[in-house]
């Protein structure tokens, strides 16, 4: 058992031309949150397939309103890590999907609205207990920078979190055959808890709950000798100590039966007894029938009852695949008109219409300014289906109800003081700085290509030299 941890460092426009429009604005403030989905192995599965290793959702980030004049390309992020606990062994190779979601905080009916801004995916190898791995992924014009790691929860240790550690019973050394648990010098590797009933003499395990047999023994608990009549067995050399024949390699050694089949010897070879749903010499053929319930997500199974008769899943709306295991992205058909936002709720599609439009598919054009009043002397501007208030100086917000504070976003750099002015804002720069926003030091200290930080540097304004 353990925890996969994800730390988002930044989310903003990637380098180069074509930077995306800010997802938030003065009229539509918003905040970000993130979702991570993990799957074992280097799977190429669809984004909608189950997050078999787990999933997590971040907290909401700070509310962001775009400020003209001092743009913030990287959007403010939620605090803390995203943590995905895993109960079993860490697989070592995994696939991830990280989604960036926007929560709009306008005064829309029914509370805040969510929309997917960006989705990145990748496949990685990662040992548990290792250092943070850094990554940069791009989705369209957006760039996401993040770090991740997998760590084991005590008492588990190791690269797969399958070895167990316990405090030492003796102060100086660990028990027979048990190693110290690096880096926990005061702990020892604990014997694994094998499957209940696993023979302590003839069985062992490398993973918890497993029972693997020593040579010469078989059965689920390693209690059955490979040949029960070993003293009369036609195989193997004679044992001088017992007078019995020690079993040599047999046809069932290594269990040739796949998919959980059990092996029994026959006079000439072996025979596999297959579990339900499989058949063939080695249980390698899937004989799934409708009785096994192979259709997911409410799919209707049609087919014969015998293993040779294939089944067919008839999928409900919104799902596809031979077992109805894949969710159809019904929004890809762009059913919402006039720039409406499509939401696939699973049981139904919903369109979130832009201001000025209505209807199940946003097909009705409304009079943008009808019944809309702009406060504090603002005037309503119609156009493009978006009701908009042009606010008088000193006011902002969707309906001009908010008193604008141009200094709220700390627009003056390097400790400059911000003053609200009838025309906007004015920065009074600290000594040694200039520029409309005090962003330029007049004389950076030092006489080389790597100067020391200027004397006016504030803790909030760290320097980076290349």
């Amino acid at each position: 058992a353990g925890v996969f941890e994800l730390q988002i460092h930044s989310f903003g426009p990637g380098p180069g031309p074509g930077a995306p429009r800010s997802p938030c604005s003065a009229r539509l403030p918003c905040r970000l949150f993130f979702r991570v989905c993990l799957k074992p192995g280097l799977s190429e599965e669809a984004a909608e397939s189950p997050c078999a290793l787990g999933a997590a959702l971040s907290a909401r980030g700070p509310v962001y309103t775009e400020q003209p004049g001092a743009p913030a390309p990287d959007l403010p992020l939620p605090d803390g890590l995203l943590q995905v606990p895993f109960r079993d062994a860490w697989p070592g190779t995994f696939s991830f999907i990280i989604e960036t979601w926007r929560e709009e905080l306008g005064d829309q009916i029914g509370g805040p609205a969510w929309s997917l801004l960006a989705r990145v995916a990748g496949r990685r190898r990662l040992a548990a207990g290792g250092p943070w791995a850094r990554d940069i992924q791009r989705a369209g014009a957006w760039e996401l920078r993040f770090s991740y790691r997998a760590r084991c929860e005590p008492p588990a240790v190791g690269t797969a979190c399958t070895r167990l550690c316990r405090p030492r019973s003796a102060p100086s050394r660990c028990g027979p055959g048990l190693r110290p648990c690096a880096p926990l010098e005061d702990e020892c590797e604990a014997p694994l808890v094998c499957r209940a009933g696993c023979s302590p003499e003839h069985g062992f395990c490398e993973q918890p709950g497993e029972c693997r047999c020593l040579e010469g023994w078989t059965g689920p608990l390693c209690t059955v000798p490979v040949s029960t009549s070993s003293c009369l067995s036609p195989r193997g050399p004679s044992s001088a100590t017992t007078g019995c024949l020690v079993p040599g390699p047999g046809p069932c050694d290594g269990n040739p039966c796949a998919n959980g089949g059990s092996c029994s010897e026959t006079p000439r070879s072996f025979e596999c007894t297959c579990p339900r749903g499989f058949y063939g010499l080695r249980c390698e053929v899937s004989g799934v029938t409708c009785a096994d319930g192979p259709c997911f997500n409410g799919g209707l199974c049609v087919g014969g009852a015998d293993p040779d008769s294939a089944y067919i899943c008839h999928c409900p709306p919104g799902f596809q695949g031979s077992n109805c295991e894949k969710r159809v992205d019904r929004c890809s058909l762009q059913p919402c008109r006039n720039g409406g936002l499509c939401l696939d709720l699973g049981h139904a599609l919903r369109c979130r219409c832009r201001a000025g439009f209505a209807g199940p598919r946003c097909e009705h054009d409304l009079d943008d300014c009808a019944g809309r009043a702009c406060a504090n002397g603002g005037t309503c501007v119609e156009g493009g289906g978006a009701h908009r208030c042009s606010c008088a100086l000193g006011f902002g917000g969707r309906d001009c109800r908010e008193r604008a504070d141009p200094c709220a976003a700390r627009p003056c750099a390097h400790g400059g003081r911000c003053y609200a002015h009838f025309s906007g804002l004015v920065c009074a720069c600290a000594p040694g700085y200039m520029g409309a926003r005090c962003e330029f030091p007049v004389h950076p200290d030092g006489a080389s290509a790597l100067p020391a930080a200027p004397p006016g540097l504030r803790p909030g304004d760290p320097q980076r030299y290349l």
Epitope: P15, A70, P71, P73, A413, F440, P441, G460, D461, P462
Partner: nanobody, 117 residues
Framework: EVQLVESGGGLVQPGGSLTLSCAAS????????MAWYRQAPGKKRELVAG???????MYIDSVKGRFTISRDNAKNSVYLQMNSLRAEDTAVYYC???????????WGQGTLVTVSS
Amino acid sequence: EVQLVESGGGLVQPGGSLTLSCAASGSSVKFLSMAWYRQAPGKKRELVAGISADGSTMYIDSVKGRFTISRDNAKNSVYLQMNSLRAEDTAVYYCYAYRWHTRYTYWGQGTLVTVSS
């Protein structure tokens, strides 16, 4: 991480012209306030010209009317067009960027401009 690479320096005669380029990577220049600084031998580094994120420009008195700072968002670069060059303009010219969101400052490695006959 924003990285800045300057180019365009060289030897030029008094009265001549040069254009310095600063290519940025790691962030779009339209989100950065950027500037050119210079450092003559034995002197402190000084601000020459700056262009804010909102596009407003500023110059020190000694270069006003001779130097022009500009930005090309498509090429993710900032330029310093230097005309009527004088011997006192000889210096290593450095590109500077201020990233508003992180409030970090970044420097390039510099390019040498020599004005001499």
